[in-house]
């Protein structure tokens, strides 16, 4: 189709090289009438239409992307030749920063419902940067983290080393949804419930006077609770003692519980105690069987081949630890009896 | 472009508020500022609003000068007008060329002119 | 409160001369470089001509140029011509709550 109708917006992603952030892109086409995409072709030039990335209904997630390349090939389906750029709905997810996804990227609706629709398309510039001015020191993470039932706020990254007197116009966008009261380079938030949690994106426009374009921000925001104040509690073995057959496989399960912490180095270990000596033992990794928000239970397994007369005299102990403290369990074997 | 209006012959001691409107961009995307000029005189920096509605104001004009917007306008108030407020009142919007330049006064209305005498 | 001392004032110059206007701000400007020189003629408002100390705004001849950094700024009309009679102000941005921006006195330059 021919995009030299299409509406043209320019995007600046500068990314950090220290760390993993992700970008997206809305298809903004103009939204006049909720029942069709656009039919610009019939607005009188007071009738100015909003841009605003649609979501919500059936209709408006059936959106194609493309990308234009840059040595004048026909237009690529994003789907088909890009992996680490995801669809969804009407967002054009960017899974990884690097200055190849600069280019242009272009999104227009599947389904022409009227010959007006057939311009009914945005051309998105997209120039990709690492970060070069070390100006900003503690400029604000890509994360963030907001503690449940206290004062929080988000800060757009681009803008945080900015001064409150010289942060440009700020447009957020929560889950795709804009934001239409917040406008300055930090969302405030009097009291954080688990909604605050999703993916904002903080616009502003940059101008040289010639023309202008739009520097965007991604920010995925969590919402934690405080770190714990305790040490991992074992919740298995609750035993110091297991019944075992000789010459039999066994397998000794560790399960413990850690609280939340914003920084979190869990350890969890299997050693062996054998009268004088202590050694760590190679077993299969650590996995989380379960994760909700105040906590993680992890489980630790020591396999044994078979159970032989040797360990008996052995104590198997389980060592948990967070940046609080350590809990033990240790495990004597004895044999079954009849 | 831009456009002030409310300037008027006024006595000493009345509050009079000027009004800012846009056409061809959306204000409520802009910080604005307002600028004065006395006959004969230089350009005065009285104070910006943000788009979030965060206001600045030079040491001279607060609490003389009260600023606010709406989706609209943006307003300049002036509190209790003296003889020295004779001025044509500028309001001009603030584009942006980054964090490493600051904020530059690109596009200005024509003025309003509030002549303050009894 | 934030001052930008301007220099000479009046200045007069030929057509086809050059002329430089000076402004000292009291103190350094935001990133050494939110200094805007501005046009105003007589019955108009005033128009920006440079930015970040020496950025040409869109539309303006190549004959104004902009130099300088922190407290110390330059204007310069190089060949002159009838048309930029105007009075010229300096206009420096600051990273304060208060007097964020500041005026020159402004400059008067007359075209003989």
């Known amino acids: 189709f021919n995009i030299s109708g299409c509406s043209t917006k320019k995007l600046l992603w500068t990314y950090s090289t220290r760390s993993e952030e992700e970008f997206v892109l809305f298809c903004d086409l103009p939204e006049p009438q909720k029942s069709h995409f656009c039919h610009r072709n019939r607005l009188s030039p007071k009738q100015v239409p909003e841009h605003l990335p649609f979501m919500g209904s059936n209709d408006l997630s059936d959106v194609q992307w493309y990308q234009q390349p840059s040595n004048g090939d026909p237009l690529e389906d994003i789907r088909k030749s890009y992996p680490h750029i995801i669809q969804d709905k009407c967002t054009l997810h960017f899974l990884t920063p690097g200055v190849n996804n600069s280019g242009s990227y272009i999104c227009r609706p599947k389904m022409i419902k009227s010959p007006y629709d057939v311009a009914c398309c945005v051309k998105m510039i997209l120039e990709v940067k690492p970060q070069t001015n070390a100006s900003c020191e503690y400029s604000a993470s890509h994360k963030q983290d907001l503690l449940l039932g206290s004062t929080g706020s988000i800060s757009c990254p681009s803008l945080s080393c900015q001064s409150d007197a010289q942060s440009p116009a700020v447009t957020w966008y929560k889950n795709g949804k804009l934001l239409s009261v917040e406008r300055s380079n930090r969302i405030v938030v009097d009291e954080v419930y688990d909604y605050h949690q999703g993916t904002y994106v903080c616009d502003y426009t940059q101008s040289d006077t010639v023309s202008s374009w739009t520097v965007r921000a991604v920010v995925q925001v969590r919402t934690i609770v405080g770190d714990t104040k305790l040490k991992p509690d074992i919740l298995d073995p609750v035993e110091d003692t297991l019944e075992v057959e000789l010459g039999k496989p066994l397998t000794i399960s560790c399960k413990a519980r850690f609280g939340f912490e914003r920084v979190f180095n869990p350890v969890i270990k299997w050693y062996i105690k054998d009268s004088d000596l202590e050694w760590e033992v190679s077993v299969p990794e650590a996995k989380s069987i379960k994760s909700t928000l105040k906590d993680e239970i992890i489980e630790r397994n020591i396999i044994l081949e078979k159970v032989t007369q040797r360990d008996l005299r052995r104590k198997f102990v389980c060592f948990v630890q967070n940046s609080i403290g350590n809990t033990t369990q240790s495990v004597q074997l004895k044999e079954k009896r009849g | 472009s831009v456009e002030e209006s409310g300037g008027r012959l006024v006595t000493p001691g009345t509050p009079l508020t000027l009004t800012c409107t846009a056409s061809g961009f959306s204000l409520s995307s802009y910080h604005m500022c307002w600028v004065r000029q006395a006959p004969g005189k230089g350009l005065e920096w009285i104070g910006f609003i943000k788009a979030d509605g965060n206001t600045y104001y030079a040491t001279w004009a607060k609490g003389r000068f009260t600023i606010s917007r709406s989706s609209a306008t943006v307003d300049l108030k002036i509190t209790s007008a003296t003889a020295e407020d004779t001025a044509t009142y500028f309001c001009?919007?603030?584009?942006?060329?980054?964090?490493?330049?600051?904020?530059?006064?690109?596009?200005w209305g024509p003025g309003t002119l509030v002549t303050v005498s009894s | 409160a934030q001052v930008l001392t301007q220099t000479p004032s009046p200045v007069s110059a030929a057509v086809g001369g050059t002329v430089t206007i000076n402004c000292q701000a009291s103190?350094?400007?935001?990133?050494?470089?939110?200094l805007a020189w501005y046009q105003q003629k007589p019955g108009q408002p005033p128009k920006l001509l440079i930015y970040?100390?020496?950025k040409l705004a869109s539309g303006v001849p190549l004959r104004f140029s902009g130099s300088g950094s922190g407290t110390q700024f330059t204007l310069t009309i190089s060949g002159v011509q009838c048309d930029d009679a105007a009075t010229y102000y300096c206009?420096?941005?600051?990273?304060?709550?208060?007097?964020?921006?500041?005026f020159g006195g402004g400059t008067e330059v007359v075209v003989k």
């Open positions: 103190q350094s400007v935001y990133n050494n470089k939110n």
């Open positions: 001009a919007r603030m584009f942006y060329a980054g964090h490493t330049s600051g904020h530059y006064f690109d596009l």
């Open positions: 206009a420096g941005g600051y990273d304060s709550s208060v007097d964020t921006f500041a």
């Open positions: 970040d100390a020496s």
